[in-house]
């Protein structure tokens, strides 16, 4: 990895577990200001592999609300608007980081957690295995 | 929101900015143990809206490496294997949380940051605007 010189103005840490426990400022900085205003909000309906969005809420997690995509069909929508099973709708998954309250119910103590979420669906050609 | 009784065993915080600055344990807990072994690793190639994955590295961010999807075509791949421009390949984007070193180069002090990443691509019917 890249070695970065330490900033002399860094907060001090006497913690023997350092750097496993760190200080995090929860005032979120949003770097998405220059993103395209034409957001992907309607893609779930217009896709050939459309999906529904399910709300997953957990007050012990930050963010507490995560939206999970579930493909509407096993096949994909063809040009006639019918479901075509020669193609497959599959979820696109991504591992994301969330903060889990630890110990539970603590407002100022968290542990980093990795979870797998389905973000949307895409249409793929199936791998077909025929019986000999 | 849901009010949760505070755990009496929580770490104490005298910080006047509390709960804006919190303690986070970086020993990541991975909750993906029961995920489907059939991972989405090859979907980028088999999709009718295929994509390439670009490595985005930033040592001031945690995680320092994020993979960004970029759709290979403006159109979608049809049954003949050709790009069909009557349909559009579009990126599925998701806002994720990352930790940004703050002040810069500090190993144990971070700020929560929200960034928009492209996870994969999906094929959508275009919105056609006809000239009057």
């Amino acid at each position: 990895g890249i070695t970065i010189p330490r900033n002399p103005g860094c907060p001090n840490s006497e913690d023997k577990n350092f750097p496993r426990t760190v200080m995090v400022n929860l005032n979120i900085h949003n770097r998405n200001t220059n993103t395209n205003p034409k957001r992907s909000s309607d893609y779930y309906n217009r896709s050939t592999s459309p999906w529904n969005l399910h709300r997953n809420e957990d007050p012990e997690r930050y963010p507490s609300v995560i939206w999970e995509a579930k493909c509407r069909h096993l096949g994909c929508i063809n040009a006639d608007g019918n479901v075509d099973y020669h193609m497959n709708s599959v979820p696109i998954q991504q591992e994301i980081l969330v903060l889990r309250r630890e110990p539970p119910h603590c407002p100022n103590s968290f542990r980093l957690e990795k979870i797998l979420v389905s973000v949307g669906c895409t249409c793929v050609t199936p791998i077909v295995h025929h019986v000999a | 929101g849901i009010t949760i009784p505070r755990n009496p065993g929580c770490p104490n915080s005298e910080d006047k900015n509390f709960p804006r600055t919190v303690m986070v344990n970086l020993n990541i807990h991975n909750r993906n143990t029961n995920t489907n072994p059939k991972r989405s690793s090859d979907y980028y190639n088999r999709s009718t809206s295929p994509w390439n994955l670009h490595r985005n590295e930033d040592p001031e961010r945690y995680p320092s490496v994020i993979w960004e999807a970029k759709c290979r075509h403006l159109g979608c791949i049809n049954a003949d294997g050709n790009v069909d421009y009557h349909m559009n390949s579009v990126p599925i984007q998701q806002e994720i949380l990352v930790l940004r070193r703050e002040p810069p180069h500090c190993p144990n002090s971070f700020r929560l940051e929200k960034i928009l990443v492209s996870v994969g691509c999906t094929c959508v019917t275009p919105i056609v605007h006809h000239v009057a």
Partner: antibody, heavy 120, light 111 residues
């Protein structure tokens, strides 16, 4: 529990269109389910005809696709089957069924079936 | 089309004894999403089919635990640990990975 009831004429002439309706009770149409038609010729096995989702998206058995139309009327809690240009080979018991479309993609509740004979 | 082949065609059994039905598909039933959409139904005389097992091995609500499903890829089995009189009828395997198709049926009858 959800109940499904097929209705329609028991006798259809060759070359005509067979029309059946399925009325769903004790359940509102939602995106979690697809609504299917299956048939069973006398003394034979089951053949899936097609389904329609809450939003009107359909999928048909390729062998019947050119002759089949399935439609839905959510306001009446009904969905319908039309099979055109029928022949004696279309004589069967026709079942409507609810397909769980959220979890396991199969028919979990069926109507009791209606017998249709194609004959002049 | 995916062809589902069931064996045997007819299965004479003694009440209280186990029974096993086999189902083979002409191509793998593993969907691109990793799931296998293979299901089992029972059709009793004069009745409509009733779902027993979904996605290979999951018992539908109200189905007794003497019924179990297993298998993967193209080969699947339905087992009844101890056959009861109410289990008699025609058993169908069905797949919904590549639209819906059914096996030809296996008739479970008293020996």
């Amino acid at each position: 529990d959800v109940q499904l009831q097929e209705s329609g004429p028991g006798l259809v002439k060759p070359s005509q269109t067979l029309s059946l309706t399925c009325t769903v009770s004790s359940y509102s149409f939602t995106s979690d389910y697809a609504w299917s038609w299956i048939r069973q010729p006398p003394g034979k096995g089951l053949e899936w005809i097609g389904y329609i989702t809450y939003s009107g998206v359909t999928s048909y058995n390729p062998s019947l696709k050119s002759r089949v139309t399935i439609s839905v009327d959510t306001s009446k809690n009904q969905f319908s089957l039309k099979l055109s240009s029928v022949t004696a080979a279309d004589t069967a018991v026709y079942y409507c069924a609810r397909a769980d479309y959220d979890s396991y993609y199969t028919m979990d509740y069926w109507g009791q079936g209606t017998s249709v004979t194609v004959s002049s | 089309d995916v062809v589902m082949t069931q064996t045997p065609l007819s299965l004479p059994v003694t009440l209280g004894q186990p029974a096993s039905i086999s189902c083979r598909s002409s191509q793998s039933l593993v969907h691109s999403n990793g799931n296998t959409y293979l299901h089992w139904y029972l059709q009793k005389p004069g009745q409509s089919p009733r779902l027993l097992i979904y996605k290979v091995s999951n018992r539908f609500s109200g189905v007794p635990d003497r019924f179990s499903g297993s298998g993967s890829g193209t080969d699947f089995t339905l087992k009844i640990s101890r056959v009861e009189a109410e289990d008699l009828g025609v058993y169908y395997c069905s797949q919904s990975t590549h639209f819906w198709t059914f096996g030809g049926g296996t008739k479970l009858e008293i020996k």
